[in-house]
């Protein structure tokens, strides 16, 4: 998906006020320097690339945080404010079916979650140059 | 403007089971969570779960192991819960409440008229 | 699970005294998730205030929420005849989402 025509302020807006709190609570009892950060993204479309790809798709060692309150907050946004976003998403939620029967908070699944905290924040200051 | 309008009122058997539908009207139906909310004769309100209609991804409640489905048809924009197994306990009205950003936040900010399940020998 | 209680189950005023309904949360929650609604005899259920504090749409100034964590309050601050119903209390931080048990406000 092509997330070039986001409403980026309102998702923006929903991030601060809800998503954000919830990524707080999924990380509650997690030292802020506990995980490096190694994603990044460069603007605002990228950005939502790369959440999406850390909030729903299955990777090794976290294959359950599509089941959590913030990624369905986050598919409410995008899906809102993202012309088309709910149409594409078909096949790949089938996809991932079977790997979401479960939902175990892992070390791993923190140190994503983490990634996705920085990855919104970058979302969150798109002027600033890449460091 | 965003409507939601249930089907009507059911009497069932113990045992058997029941389908109701929700149809929206006023919004993208594919875009926005659908939840359904019961509430047993004089009693408060109870979640049952979720669906996303845009990939069908659903959230249920576990108290209900396995005996509500809830699914929805996009090419009418309808959302449905079926519930087996029925009790008499289940006697309630049945509700379902979109989930929506407002002001920023999310909730339920629209819900059906509310369909009454009876279920009775 | 997170279990919502309200108190007082029932709360009898007179037209134009103040009501406070309490809503204690079994584990801290964020305030943008604590939601409440008002519901009459044979209606839905309607949002009235969203994230702890702010009015549902067409909701008077005399209702008002605050709090924070595992302590909430939604307070009318003159009861007219129409505010007469049940409030329930809401969270949207965890699985299964839940609601309180509800305070019905009844004329003295």
């Known amino acids: 998906y092509d997330f070039t025509n986001c409403d980026f302020e309102k998702i923006k807006a929903a991030y601060l006020s809800t998503i954000s709190k919830d990524l707080i609570t999924y990380m509650s009892g997690t030292k802020s320097t506990e995980f490096n950060n190694t994603v990044s993204c460069s603007n605002r479309p990228h950005c939502l690339t790369e959440i999406q790809s850390l909030t729903f798709n299955p990777t090794a060692g976290c294959a359950s945080l599509a089941k959590e309150m913030f990624a369905m907050k986050t598919k409410a946004a995008l899906a809102i404010w993202c012309p088309g976003y709910s149409e594409t998403q078909i096949n790949a939620t089938q996809a991932m079916k079977k790997a979401r029967k479960s939902k175990v908070t892992t070390n791993k699944c923190l140190e994503q979650v983490s990634q996705l905290q920085g990855l919104w924040r970058r979302f969150n200051r798109p002027l600033l140059k890449q460091q | 403007q965003v409507q939601l309008v249930q089907s009507g009122a059911e009497v069932k058997k113990p045992g058997s089971s029941v389908k109701v539908s929700c149809k929206a009207s006023?919004?993208?139906?594919?875009?926005?969570?659908m939840n359904w909310v019961r509430q047993a004769p004089g009693q408060g309100l109870e979640w049952m779960g979720q669906?996303?209609?845009?990939?069908?991804?659903?959230n249920y409640n576990g108290k209900f192991k396995g005996r509500v489905t809830i699914t929805a048809d996009k090419s009418t924009s309808t959302a449905y819960m079926e519930l087996s197994s029925l009790r008499s306990e289940d006697t309630a009205v049945y509700y379902c409440a979109r989930g929506g950003y407002v002001n920023f936040l999310y909730a339920m900010d629209y819900w059906g008229q509310g369909t009454t399940v009876t279920v009775s020998s | 699970e997170i279990v919502m209680t309200q108190s007082p189950a029932t709360l009898s005023v007179s037209p134009g005294e103040r009501a406070t309904l309490s809503c204690s949360v079994s584990?801290?929650?964020?305030?943008?998730?604590l939601h409440w609604y008002q519901q009459k005899p044979g209606q839905s259920p309607r949002p009235w205030i969203y994230?702890?504090?702010t009015l549902a749409s067409g909701i008077p100034a005399r209702f008002s929420g605050s709090g924070s964590g595992t302590e909430f309050t939604l307070t009318i601050s003159s009861l007219q005849s129409e505010d007469f119903a049940v409030y329930y209390c809401q969270q949207w931080s965890s699985y299964p989402l839940t609601f309180g048990g509800g305070t019905k406000v009844e004329i003295k």
């Open positions: 584990s801290s929650i964020s305030s943008s998730n």
């Open positions: 006023g919004y993208a139906f594919s875009s926005y969570w």
């Open positions: 669906i996303f209609p845009g990939d069908g991804e659903t």
């Open positions: 994230g702890t504090s």
